[in-house]
């Protein structure tokens, strides 16, 4: 025969936070470490599960197919209730009745989801929405992989995603001094570098590489490289290509220059030789299937030429160089040097020997070209 449970038998209510889709274990312990009768009910007094004899029985609640108990722990006086595949509507006060005592546990289930696809282009915005039970007033704090902290309530917005935002975001939901942690994987679709510059001597082969800052199982799309040569009045499409399951196939390529493109990732292009007429800047765009917008990478080509014509030794560079770069001509193992923050330097009547043309940035050599000046013998005067 069961005794009535008085108010003083009602233990203080515990608060447990759960995550949508996860499993939670609500504990209930008897004072005696032995198997005894227990029941779990919801706030409407509907039985969820309990013990009858030695068997677990389930009541008519909505949880019946998702609720369970650890039978192996019953003889230790532990009568927990496990709820699988949590739903927001599972948030409720659950009552465990054991040994004429009632233990109340308030379960609050939260869900945190990205409003859109978690694969977003650089510059696009990310919105995280918190699902929470009625009557709760949680706060959310998210930390990006790069260490950026963002706080919010029901929604958290990141207006412009950057490359370094790719990775696992850790979001902490707090309610009643309790916390639950969510991890959301965000992939920012971008090239590893926004811009790169290739420095080459005239005639050398040029390599352009466009590594992606992400990996996808299936990568499909199309791309194009537009080129604005310094000497040209308008830009020109150098190559268009398709990408299907990470395989690159060239659709159309300009005849001058005759580019080669690799068929495997990372996207890779080679130019047979660096020439002044190719110096300039390009923009490679990649449109991915089922994504709005395009990925961009800028690439610059700087070409150097050292020439000797009659009594003039000249060194020139073409392409996008910053005004702080220094161009110098110096004679090897000698002090003779001429330097300018310009795109051309020259020496009249240069001494014989090996001359070096150097393009430098604050002392760091970006590009060098050697040219040998042979001694010029005076022409004998005709009688």
């Amino acid at each position: 025969e069961q005794k009535l449970i008085s108010e003083e038998d009602l233990a203080a209510k515990k608060v447990v936070l759960g995550k949508k889709g996860d499993t939670v274990e609500l504990t209930c312990n008897a004072s005696q470490k032995k198997n005894t009768q227990f029941h779990w009910k919801n706030s409407n007094q509907i039985k969820i599960l309990g013990i009858q004899g030695l068997f677990l029985t389930k009541g008519p609640s909505k949880l019946s197919d998702r609720a369970d108990s650890r039978k192996s722990l019953w003889d230790q006086g532990c009568f927990s209730m496990i709820i699988k595949n949590l739903k927001i509507e599972d948030s409720d006060t659950y009552i465990c009745e054991v040994e004429n005592k009632k233990e109340e546990v308030e379960l609050l289930v939260f869900g945190l989801t990205a409003n859109s696809d978690t694969h977003l282009l650089e510059g696009q915005s990310l919105t995280l929405t918190l699902e929470s039970p009625p009557g709760s007033s949680p706060s959310v704090k998210c930390r990006s992989p790069g260490g950026k902290n963002i706080q919010g309530g029901r929604t958290i917005s990141v207006p412009q995603l950057e490359r370094q935002d790719s990775g696992t975001w850790t979001c902490t939901v707090s309610q009643d001094q309790k916390t639950v942690e969510f991890k959301i994987d965000i992939v920012v679709l971008a090239f590893q570098k926004a811009s790169s510059t290739v420095y080459k001597k005239e005639g050398e082969q040029v390599e352009f590489s466009f590594p992606l800052a992400f990996t996808l199982e299936k990568l499909t799309g199309s791309g194009e490289l537009w080129w604005q040569a310094e000497r040209a009045s308008s830009s020109k499409s150098w190559i268009t290509f398709d990408l299907k399951n990470k395989e690159v196939s060239v659709k159309r390529v300009t005849q001058d220059p005759k580019l080669q493109m690799g068929k495997k990732l990372p996207l890779h292009l080679t130019l047979p030789q660096a020439l002044p007429q190719y110096a300039g800047s390009g923009n490679l765009t990649l449109a991915l299937e089922a994504k709005t917008g395009k990925l961009h990478q800028e690439v610059n080509l700087v070409v150097m030429r050292a020439t000797q014509f009659q009594e003039n030794l000249t060194c020139e560079v073409w392409g996008p160089t910053s005004p702080k770069l220094t161009l110098s001509l110096k004679l090897e193992n000698k002090g003779a040097t001429v330097s300018k923050q310009a795109k051309a330097v020259w020496v009249l009547n240069p001494e014989a020997g090996m001359w070096q043309c150097l393009l430098s940035d604050s002392g760091q050599v970006l590009l060098e070209s050697n040219i040998k000046v042979v001694p010029t013998w005076p022409t004998p005067v005709q009688p």
Partner: antibody, heavy 119, light 107 residues
Framework: EVQLLESGGGLVQPGGSLRLSCAAS????????MSWVRQAPGKGLEWVSG????????YYADSVKGRFIISRDISKNTLYLEMNSLRAEDTAVYYC????????????WGQGTLVTVSS | AIQMTQSPSSLSASVGDRVTITCRAS??????LGWYQQKPGKAPKLLIY???SLQSGVPSRFSGSGSGTDFTLTISSLQPEDFATYYC?????????FGQGTKLEIK
């Protein structure tokens, strides 16, 4: 076990046609890139034609462009090479070859089939 | 098309020798290069892929190196079964191209 078995070679007159087949088994034919490679008697290897696994795109060496057609029948796991306007210089042993999953070289080859173009 | 220049075209060596074969591409091809061995009347066999990766089942005396335009196949200690013809193949892009081959003969 991966197997590639070529057939369809033989003697053909200049200007004639021939269709080579390569029956494949032991791997996922539909997603693998495949190629035909030939070797003229006493000469080196020459890549002839290829078909992409991912998009079915076809590619040819300049020496056969416009005359040869590569194709595949996924339901039959078979690769084909349709050879038209054959010339004496097309005489060779033709091999069918399977590319590695990530397009790094040909890891499996057939035993080859001899095509002789002669009058 | 990318041209592949292989050297030497023939080579005489003895069992136990260290042998090196080189291949040069007319364009930068990253590491998209394979090495093949062919014996008379047989189909070629892949030895090295991606310039330096040893194909499964191939003895470790075979090694590959290089990147960009210059590549090398090295056999550290020649065995009797290694006398064959060796080819490089660029698979950077289509049309693929083979080197002319190097015939390795017994001295």
């Amino acid at each position: 076990e991966v197997q590639l078995l070529e057939s369809g070679g033989g003697l053909v007159q200049p200007g004639g046609s021939l269709r080579l087949s390569c029956a494949a088994s032991g791997f996922t034919f539909s997603t693998n890139a495949m190629s035909w490679v030939r070797q003229a008697p006493g000469k080196g290897l020459e890549w002839v034609s290829g078909i992409s696994g991912s998009n079915g795109n076809t590619y040819y060496a300049d020496s056969v462009k416009g005359r040869f057609i590569i194709s595949r029948d996924i339901s039959k796991n078979t690769l084909y090479l349709e050879m038209n306007s054959l010339r004496a210089e097309d005489t060779a042993v033709y091999y069918c070859a399977k590319e590695r999953d990530n397009w790094n070289g040909f890891d499996y080859w057939g035993q080859g089939t001899l095509v002789t173009v002669s009058s | 098309a990318i041209q592949m220049t292989q050297s030497p075209s023939s080579l005489s060596a003895s069992v136990g020798d260290r042998v090196t074969i080189t291949c040069r591409a007319s364009h930068v091809i990253r590491n998209d290069l394979g090495w093949y061995q062919q014996k008379p009347g047989k189909a070629p066999k892949l030895l090295i892929y991606a310039a330096s990766s040893l194909q499964s089942g191939v003895p470790s005396r075979f090694s590959g190196s290089g990147s960009g335009t210059d590549f090398t196949l090295t056999i550290s200690s020649l065995q009797p079964e290694d006398f064959a013809t060796y080819y490089c193949l660029q698979d950077y892009n289509y049309p693929y191209t083979f080197g002319q081959g190097t015939k390795l003969e017994i001295k």
